[in-house]
Interface confidence: low
């Protein structure tokens, strides 16, 4: 049986709806793939990604991935379907309106990932849940 929040359309594509049955439109996310970053030891950083993309599928959410190794720091911003793993991790926080970074175990690097489901929510990545977004001391991402 088809769950109540997913309806089949005539042409066999999925029409994604929310729990109230309203059609869920694709959301907007920052989508710059990977950029070198200077975001380090901060409570929060802005992506400084100039590309806002309409996600390809209505169920996709915004994702940000922060990686640090011996050579550099990168910040990745994409759309992704939360039903599918990303970087081999499940997007556990996909319903969150804010992108709260959580550390994941990856050998050889420091790896944080967050996902969220409000428009352009991966523009502001938060490493501390108590962080006050009015703090002016944000370190911006530098484009490669």
């Amino acid at each position: 049986t088809i769950p109540p929040h997913v309806q089949k359309s005539v042409n066999n594509d999925m029409i994604v709806t929310d729990n109230n049955g309203a059609v869920k439109f694709p959301q907007l996310c920052k989508f710059c793939d990977v950029r070198f970053s200077t975001c380090d030891n901060q409570k929060s950083c802005m992506s400084n990604c100039s590309i806002t993309s309409i996600c390809e599928k209505p169920q996709e959410v915004c994702v940000a991935v922060w990686r640090k190794n011996d050579e550099n720091i990168t910040l990745e911003t994409v759309c992704h379907d939360p039903k599918l793993p990303y970087h081999d991790f499940i997007l556990e926080d996909a319903a969150s309106p804010k992108c709260i970074m959580k550390e994941k175990k990856k050998p050889g690097e420091t790896f944080f990932m967050c996902s969220c489901s409000s428009d352009e929510c991966n523009d502001n990545i938060i490493f501390s849940e108590e962080y006050n977004t009015s703090n002016p001391d944000l370190l911006l991402v530098i484009f490669q």
Epitope: F31, C32, D33, V34, R35, I51, S53, E56, V65, N69, E71, T74, E76, V78, Y86, H87, D88, K106, P107, G108, E109, F143, Q144
Partner: antibody, heavy 121, light 107 residues
Framework: QVQLVESGGGLVQPGGSLRLSCAVS????????MSWVRQAPGKGLEWVSS????????HNTDSVKGRFSISRDNSKNTLYLQMNSLRAEDTAVYFC??????????????WGQGTLVTVSS | DIQMTQSPSSLSASVGDRVTITCRAS??????LNWYQQKPGKAPKLLIY???SLQSGVPSRFSGSGSGTDFTLTISSLQPEDFATYYC?????????FGQGTKVEIK
Amino acid sequence: QVQLVESGGGLVQPGGSLRLSCAVSGFQFRRYAMSWVRQAPGKGLEWVSSISASGDRTHNTDSVKGRFSISRDNSKNTLYLQMNSLRAEDTAVYFCAKGLAASGKNYFDPWGQGTLVTVSS
Amino acid sequence: DIQMTQSPSSLSASVGDRVTITCRASQSISSYLNWYQQKPGKAPKLLIYAASSLQSGVPSRFSGSGSGTDFTLTISSLQPEDFATYYCQQSYSTPPTFGQGTKVEIK
């Protein structure tokens, strides 16, 4: 169905130029990084160049820097490789491929069928 | 640049054999390792990405493992269509680099 079709290869003299094209269909071209990978006759694979989804960032392997230039036209769903000052060692089959952003999906997939570039006098 | 070294460079095997190909990186690449299959005159085909994730449509007899510097591609039961050359590729840092290839031939 995803398709990548390369064209523009051929025989060229050392020091000459060629422009390769890769026509893409079946996915949202503007949303993905694209790359060129080459394979000399009887040899292995060598990454040549990559370009970001928007076209604002490019990377080239050291051996082609200053000679090759990757570009894209998102309105035409086409990837290009402008090759100048060609050398004998540039002789190879050149493949275009979807991908390579430095992410967990940092792989080349799918690939075009390739176009042969022969540099010889 | 990160060097990728595959072994063996070639091997002979029979249909039904279990085949293992190894790939070693010159420095730690975490799990940023991909495997491709290439048949003569054809484009490479992605088999495994992120060291162990099977690409959609690839038969489950292919598997990948490893992390850091040492990685393995295993074909659990070799099929006639599996005779080809296999390449590993690191995607940890630019430039992305490939192994020299392992040719799997019919014994």
